[in-house]
Interface confidence: low
């Protein structure tokens, strides 16, 4: 029998330019008679134009929903009912070509053409895009709160906030032709549930979404987004009811920035410069294309690209790259945002140089990408260290910590976390190196102790970048570096004179003068440690809840011992800045560290002084007994302690702890405690210091209380943020 043809709805969205009409402000108000009258005429014209072509057979409906500058631009959508088998034949490009052909055929015609009765439509200004029924529904839901804004060159326009009676609003933004729009979003509240979506076209077309942001993001308090051209739409969806705008939006037109560079690198190792997407740190725009050509001075060198929170991965099955496509020496790689550092190492085999291309393959974009570039020695990429092939980074080898995700930096070690004697490859513990006592057969542990040595895992790097063999030489009263830098910044780590209770668990005043109590509305929440005159370090997870993210909530107490009373040595501070480690990941507890800048510098006293910070190479030997302090609960699930408690814990080898916690322990973590449990940190101790005493009598910060299974349970150690794993970030912030 006869089978009726299956018809499908195909939705198109677009804009056209009218040359004999001019835009006026009346046309931005949907309730105005000017808008109603212009819409009726434009609607009629659009329908007549479509039905004048062979698309007329399929015409279903259409709507002009907005106007803009140019002299007058009409924004519209229409639906065609198409036989299913012809669906692919009527792509937006084909439909646009048919309509343009129709317009061109009547440009010089003297015959009366219905759609030309009122309007002179510019064939070159017609744009047709693919849309969906869902897109039209999304558009219609915003029309009760629709704002059109034109922003001129050199202007920065602050957009009027949303209408709080509406559940959704749309800002339709337009700038001068040949420029691109840059939108700035700044979240102004600590907590909200609002959603904002930015599109690379005039309306909310899902396929042209640039990015969407949600709920007063603390990770990105300010977001700058670039469109590929002079048109953009921003859609707001209401979260919790609020009379205050949780965000500020502003927009400005900017010129296209070329993203092409030819560079010749110098004959030296390490970073030599930075490449970045246009307007970094703005999100890169759809249709970004960067091409960087780098020439290497000799085939001895390879090219290294160091990324921050971004990695390159091979993409399977030729799927599009959703976070940026890279081509490097004909290899196609996809960008991937990660909470880790990463390096791409490119072996150089020809003097012609290397071309690196970056392209945004889809309209969905992301934070701008910045990469440091430099050279590495192809025959020895990581002098004194191990090249981790998984992430391209140089990591310490054989230090007892699997820094490389595949653990190969700890494989095939003759001496793990110990010193290897030259004579017979016996291993001696690191504190025995350069201690004045020969321990190796021919005394190789005491050689080269007064001179510079090649830098390695356990060598200390002086300020002049030379290295010394003696482990942990900082602040021991003897200058080991030629420039004396190992004895600088040593006003730290000394306890105040205290009448300590021998063997007692309660600390006395001045015993731990770096200990901080971080409080919200008079309630102790977390511990912390003073590390500089205006900086306290703590755990990032203390600020995990949105309600705890605002600096105004927090008060920092130093010199405190008892929670329920004050004594003269105690001082308090407000917080002027709160910085979480950029790689902090709540789920895994990785990089669990935060820095608080105090509102004024501390005045040092017997009860208030900073702890010493270790160098990256500082070795805290497993088995060493160290101390944790805090006002945390005295038993699992119990209330916090009134008195500052102290407890000794033993540092645990990383592999043992990793096994116990089923490999959830990262290189930025350190474990301490006892197999039998009992001595441990607990709730309320978070962020507090784990300190170890050096032979010099100074206390060094080894860790911050981070996480663990329960408190003091047998077989489960406490897990601490490893300070040596995050020290470079700390120093970068504090200095």
């Amino acid at each position: 029998g006869y089978k009726a043809e299956v018809m499908v709805s195909q939705v198109y969205s677009g804009s056209l330019r009218v040359l004999n009409r001019h835009f006026s402000q009346d046309l931005t108000r949907r309730e105005s008679s000017a808008f109603r009258s212009e819409t009726a005429k434009a609607q009629k014209m659009l329908k007549e134009l479509i039905t004048s072509t062979r698309l007329g057979t399929y015409y279903n409906s259409s709507s002009v929903y907005s106007f803009g500058e140019g002299p007058l631009t009409c924004f519209f959508w229409f639906i065609l009912q198409i036989p299913e088998h012809r669906r692919l034949m009527l792509s937006p490009e084909v439909v646009q070509a048919l309509l343009v052909e129709e317009l061109l055929s009547t440009v010089n015609s003297s015959a009366a053409v219905p759609y030309r009765a009122e309007y002179e439509v510019d064939p070159e200004g017609l744009v047709i895009l693919e849309a969906s029924v869902k897109d039209i529904a999304a558009l219609n839901s915003t029309l009760g709160c629709y704002r059109y804004s034109y922003v001129g060159q050199g202007q920065v326009l602050r957009l009027k906030g949303p209408d709080h009676l509406a559940s959704s609003c749309l800002w339709h933004l337009q700038g001068p032709k040949d420029l691109m729009l840059k939108l700035r979003l700044e979240w102004t509240l600590a907590e909200c549930r609002d959603r904002l979506a930015m599109y690379d076209v005039a309306g909310p077309l899902e396929k042209r979404l640039i990015t969407s942001v949600y709920g007063c993001s603390r990770q990105e308090p300010v977001v700058e987004v670039l469109a590929s051209g002079a048109i953009m739409a921003v859609v707001w969806k209401k979260g919790l009811h609020s009379y205050y705008d949780p965000f500020v939006l502003s927009v400005q037109p900017v010129v296209f920035q070329a993203c092409e560079v030819n560079l010749t690198l110098d004959n030296r190792l390490d970073s030599q410069g930075v490449l970045s997407t246009p307007y970094f740190p703005s999100y890169y725009s759809p249709q970004t294309h960067c091409s960087w050509h780098l020439t290497v001075p000799s085939l001895d060198y390879g090219l290294a690209l160091w990324f921050d929170a971004y990695a390159l991965r091979r993409q399977k099955y030729d799927l599009p790259c959703t976070q940026g496509q890279w081509t490097i020496q004909n290899r196609r790689l996809c960008g991937l945002r990660i909470l880790q550092p990463y390096a791409e190492r490119i072996p150089v085999v020809a003097t012609a140089g290397i071309t690196i291309n970056f392209t945004s393959q889809i309209s969905l974009t992301g934070p701008g990408v910045r990469v440091h570039y430099g050279l590495y020695n192809q025959s020895d990429p990581c002098p004194g260290e191990f090249l981790c092939s998984v992430n391209g980074l140089c990591v310490p080898a054989c230090d007892g910590v699997k820094d490389c995700p595949n653990g190969l930096d700890e494989r095939n070690c003759v001496c793990r976390a110990t010193f290897q004697c030259k004579e017979d490859s016996t291993c001696i513990s690191l504190p025995k190196v350069c201690d004045g006592q020969p321990d190796c057969l021919n005394g190789s542990d005491e050689e080269q102790c007064q001179e510079g040595v090649p830098c390695g895992t356990f060598t200390f790097q002086c300020e002049d970048r030379s290295c010394v063999k003696k482990p942990n030489p900082q602040c021991d009263g003897r200058p080991d570096c030629r420039d004396g830098s190992d004895e600088e910044h040593c006003d730290c780590g000394l306890q105040g004179p205290s009448s300590r209770i021998v063997g007692g668990a309660v600390s006395s005043e001045g015993e731990w003068p770096w200990q901080a109590s971080l409080q919200v509305r008079g309630r102790h929440i977390c511990g912390g440690a003073l590390i500089a005159d205006r900086w306290v370090i703590t755990a990032a997870h203390c600020f995990q809840e949105d309600s705890m993210a605002s600096t105004v909530l927090w008060t920092v107490f130093l010199g405190k011992v008892w929670q329920n009373s004050r004594w003269p040595g105690e001082v308090s501070f407000k917080v002027s800045r709160l910085l979480l480690h950029p790689y902090h990941e709540e789920d895994s507890h990785d990089y669990d560290v935060a820095l608080l800048q105090l509102d004024h510098p501390v005045v040092r006293s017997a009860a208030v002084r900073p702890v010493c910070l270790p160098a990256r190479s500082h070795f805290f030997e497993p088995g060493l007994h160290c101390w944790i302090t805090g006002w945390g609960a005295l038993r699992e699930g119990g209330p916090i302690s009134n008195a500052l408690q102290k407890v000794d814990v033993q540092l645990i080898p990383q592999d043992l702890c990793s096994e116990v916690y089923r490999y959830q322990v990262t290189p930025r973590m350190l474990c301490a405690g006892y197999r039998k449990g009992k001595k441990d940190a607990c709730q309320g101790d978070s962020g507090g210091p784990l300190v170890c005493k050096a032979l010099s009598g100074r206390w060094f910060l080894a860790g911050l209380v981070s996480w663990g299974l329960g408190c003091g349970r047998p077989n489960y150690f406490g897990v601490y943020t490893r300070i040596t794993g995050v020290i470079s970030w700390i120093q970068q912030v504090v200095t």
Epitope: V390, N406, G407, R411, S658, E659, R662, Y663
Partner: antibody, heavy 119, light 110 residues
Framework: QVQLVESGGGVVQPGRSLRLSCTAS????????MHWVRQTPGKGLEWVAV????????YYADSVQGRFTISRDNSKNSLYLQMNSLRADDTAVYYC????????????WGQGTLVTVSS | QSVLTQPPSVSEAPRQRVTISCSGS????????VNWYQQLPGKAPKLLIS???LLPSGVSDRFSGSKSGTSASLAISGLQSADEADYYC???????????FGGGTKLTVL
């Protein structure tokens, strides 16, 4: 309830190829390394290969290196073992096993699939 | 010939205690954790002990593991007929870059 189900076993002639599959359910597949372990009839266990949770690395026992390829499709919760140039001594029950990330603790095993290489 | 050496069989009366040994070298047991697996007749292996002495949830505390130097052992107390099975030790071997198993020990409950 974690379940691993192997399939693809059978009788095959020496020199030919076979592809084994293992489908996981009740588990966050992407968080774990996956291994193949085999057991020759009436004999002990022999580890064959591992693939890291994120597909970044795979290792093989010397006896299968260059002939077998382990792969996974995290979107399908599936693990595969492509076996080429099969030999009579590859005859075994092949088990897929879930490994703790970066470790070799096999906490869940499939029921096994028998591969017989015979002319 | 297995890299890790286990006795081929052991037997003991019900309610008694039995120990199964597993001997290796510095490149496997000496440097890495040992895991034990139980394989009941006609079934797939099951994890019994991980990391030398850790008991996975759901495994009876009649089973215990220990390690000293390059040897490990599995002890089963209060023997039951349901414990009749093959027991395998396993460890990573640094020089082979592979997981190595013992040849297996058949436990008979008399």
């Amino acid at each position: 309830q974690v379940q691993l189900v192997e399939s693809g076993g059978g009788v095959v002639q020496p020199g030919r190829s076979l592809r084994l599959s293992c489908t996981a359910s009740g588990v966050t597949f992407t968080n774990f390394d996956m291994h193949w372990v085999r057991q020759t009839p009436g004999k002990g266990l022999e580890w064959v290969a591992v693939i890291w949770y994120d597909e970044s690395y795979s290792y093989y026992a010397d006896s299968v290196q260059g002939r077998f390829t382990i792969s996974r499709d995290n979107s399908k919760n599936s693990l595969y073992l492509q076996m080429n140039s099969l030999r009579a001594d590859d005859t075994a029950v092949y088990y897929c096993a879930r490994g703790w990330t970066g470790s070799y603790v096999f906490d869940y095993w499939g029921q096994g699939t028998l591969v017989t290489v015979s002319s | 010939q297995s890299v890790l050496t286990q006795p081929p069989s052991v037997s003991e009366a019900p309610r008694q205690r039995v120990t199964i040994s597993c001997s290796g070298s510095s490149s496997n047991i000496g440097n890495n954790a040992v895991n034990w697996y139980q394989q009941l007749p006609g079934k797939a292996p099951k994890l019994l002990i991980s990391y030398d002495d850790l008991l996975p949830s759901g495994v009876s505390d009649r089973f215990s593991g220990s390690k000293s130097g390059t040897s490990a052992s599995l002890a089963i107390s209060g023997l039951q007929s349901a414990d009749e099975a093959d027991y395998y030790c396993a460890a990573w071997d640094d020089s082979l870059n592979a997981v190595v198993f013992g040849g297996g020990t058949k436990l008979t409950v008399l």
